[in-house]
C-alpha cells in the first residue's frame, strides 16, 4: 500500500517521500496527465501504468500491503500472493528509477501545478 511505498522511497532515495515526490511534475502523486516533465516524472508515469495493470487484475493498490526487505541498497520483495508480489515489484521499479534520476531532480517541479500539465 501507500505506506509501504513511502517507506521504500525514503529508504532507497534518502528523501522525504511526500514533500519530494508527492506533488512532483505531472505524474508523481495523485492522478496524472500530459507529458512527463523529466526523468523523475517519467518514473512516476511508468509506476502509474504499472498500478493500472494491477488494478485491472483485481488488486486494490491503495490498501493492499506487502512485505519487503531492504539491505545494502537492495529491495527484496518477500513471498506472498500475486497482488503482494506484483505491487511490491511496481514500487521497487519506481524507487530504483527515482534513485537513478536523483541527479536530474529539479526543485522547480517539486510542487508543479497540475493545470500546467497538457
Amino acid at each position: 500500500g501507500l505506506l509501504d511505498l513511502k517507506s521504500m522511497i525514503e529508504k532507497v532515495t534518502g528523501k522525504n517521500a511526500l514533500t519530494n515526490y508527492g506533488f512532483y511534475g505531472c505524474y508523481c502523486g495523485w492522478g496524472g496527465r500530459g507529458t512527463p516533465k523529466d526523468g523523475t516524472d517519467w518514473c512516476c508515469w511508468a509506476h502509474d501504468h504499472c498500478y493500472g495493470r494491477l488494478e485491472e487484475k483485481g488488486c486494490n493498490i491503495r490498501t493492499q500491503s506487502y512485505k519487503y526487505r531492504f539491505a545494502w541498497g537492495v529491495v527484496t520483495c518477500e513471498p506472498g500472493p500475486f497482488c503482494h508480489v506484483n505491487l511490491c515489484a511496481c514500487d521497487r521499479k519506481l524507487v530504483y528509477c527515482l534513485k537513478r534520476n536523483l541527479r536530474s531532480y529539479n526543485p522547480q517541479y517539486q510542487y508543479f501545478p497540475n493545470i500546467l500539465c497538457s
Epitope: 487484475k57 488488486c59 506472498g80
Partner: antibody, heavy 116, light 106 residues
Framework: EVQLQLSGADLVKPGASVKLSCTAS????????IHWVKQRPEPGLEWIGR????????KYDPKFQGKATITADTSSNTAYLQLTSLTSEDTAVYYC?????????WGQGTTLTVSS | QIVLTQSPAIMSASPGEKVTMTCSAS?????MYWYQQKPGSSPRLLIY???NLASGVPVRFSGSGSGTSYSLTISRMEAEDAATYYC?????????FGAGTKLELK
C-alpha cells in the same frame, strides 16, 4: 463468474503418469498465479507448487520436486499438473486454485486413485 | 519450512456462541490466511492478509494476530459455520497449511 474446472484424474496403475488439467473461465490465467494443492485425510492440505502463467515461472515444495510438473497454456486458459511414477501415496484429491489476493477461487477437486 | 499448529483440533459450539480458534507458526510470519472447508466441497477463502474479509464472507468472521500467533473468530456461531478451518502462511516457500480445526454444531 470465476470458475476452475478440473479433469484428468482417474484410476491409474502404480508406476504410471497422469496429467491433470485446470481450465479457467471468468478470468485470464495470465492475470494471476495458479496453484496446485493435494488433500488426503492425513496430513490434510499439502501445497504442491504454483505457476505464473504470464512467463511460465514455477515454484514447488521440495517434497514434490521430481514428482510434479506444473505447466500452463494461456491460449486455452488452462493449467496442468503432471504426476509421474505414481504410487499409492499419490492417491488423493487434487485442487487447482487461483491466486490474486490469496487462494481466492478453488476448483471442485479431482480424485486420483492409484491402484493395481 | 514453517509449521502451522492449529488448536483445538476439534471443537463444538452452540448457535449464537462466540468461537475462537488459533494458529501458531513455528517462526514469525507476516500474514495469515484462513479457509473454510465443508465435507465434499473445496476450500473457500475466508480471511486474507490476517484480517481482511474475502468477498461474500459474513461479517461475523474476523481474523487477527501477528508474529507467530494468529486467530480466527466467529462472533456468533451459525449452523452453516460447521466445517473444518485451515490456516495458511505465505511468508516463505513452501506454502504450508495447518492441520485444521473441525468446528461442530452443538
Amino acid at each position: 463468474e470465476v470458475q476452475l474446472q478440473l479433469s484428468g484424474a482417474d484410476l491409474v496403475k502404480p508406476g504410471a503418469s497422469v496429467k491433470l488439467s485446470c481450465t479457467a473461465s471468468g478470468f485470464n490465467i495470465k492475470d494471476s498465479y495458479i496453484h496446485w494443492v493435494k488433500q488426503r485425510p492425513e496430513p490434510g492440505l499439502e501445497w504442491i507448487g504454483r505457476i505464473d502463467p504470464a512467463n511460465g515461472n514455477t515454484k514447488y515444495d521440495p517434497k514434490f520436486q521430481g514428482k510434479a510438473t506444473i505447466t500452463a497454456d494461456t491460449s486455452s486458459n488452462t493449467a496442468y499438473l503432471q504426476l509421474t511414477s505414481l504410487t499409492s501415496e499419490d492417491t488423493a484429491v487434487y485442487y487447482c486454485a487461483r491466486d490474486v489476493v490469496a487462494l481466492d477461487y478453488w476448483g471442485q477437486g479431482t480424485t486420483l486413485t492409484v491402484s493395481s | 519450512q514453517i509449521v502451522l499448529t492449529q488448536s483445538p483440533a476439534i471443537m463444538s459450539a452452540s448457535p449464537g456462541e462466540k468461537v475462537t480458534m488459533t494458529c501458531s507458526a513455528s517462526s514469525s510470519v507476516s500474514y495469515m490466511y484462513w479457509y473454510q472447508q465443508k465435507p465434499g466441497s473445496s476450500p473457500r477463502l475466508l480471511i486474507y492478509d490476517t484480517s481482511n474479509l474475502a468477498s461474500g464472507v459474513p461479517v461475523r468472521f474476523s481474523g487477527s494476530g501477528s508474529g507467530t500467533s494468529y486467530s480466527l473468530t466467529i462472533s456468533r456461531m451459525e449452523a452453516e459455520d460447521a466445517a473444518t478451518y485451515y490456516c495458511q502462511q505465505w511468508s516463505s516457500y513452501p506454502l504450508t497449511f495447518g492441520a485444521g480445526t473441525k468446528l461442530e454444531l452443538k
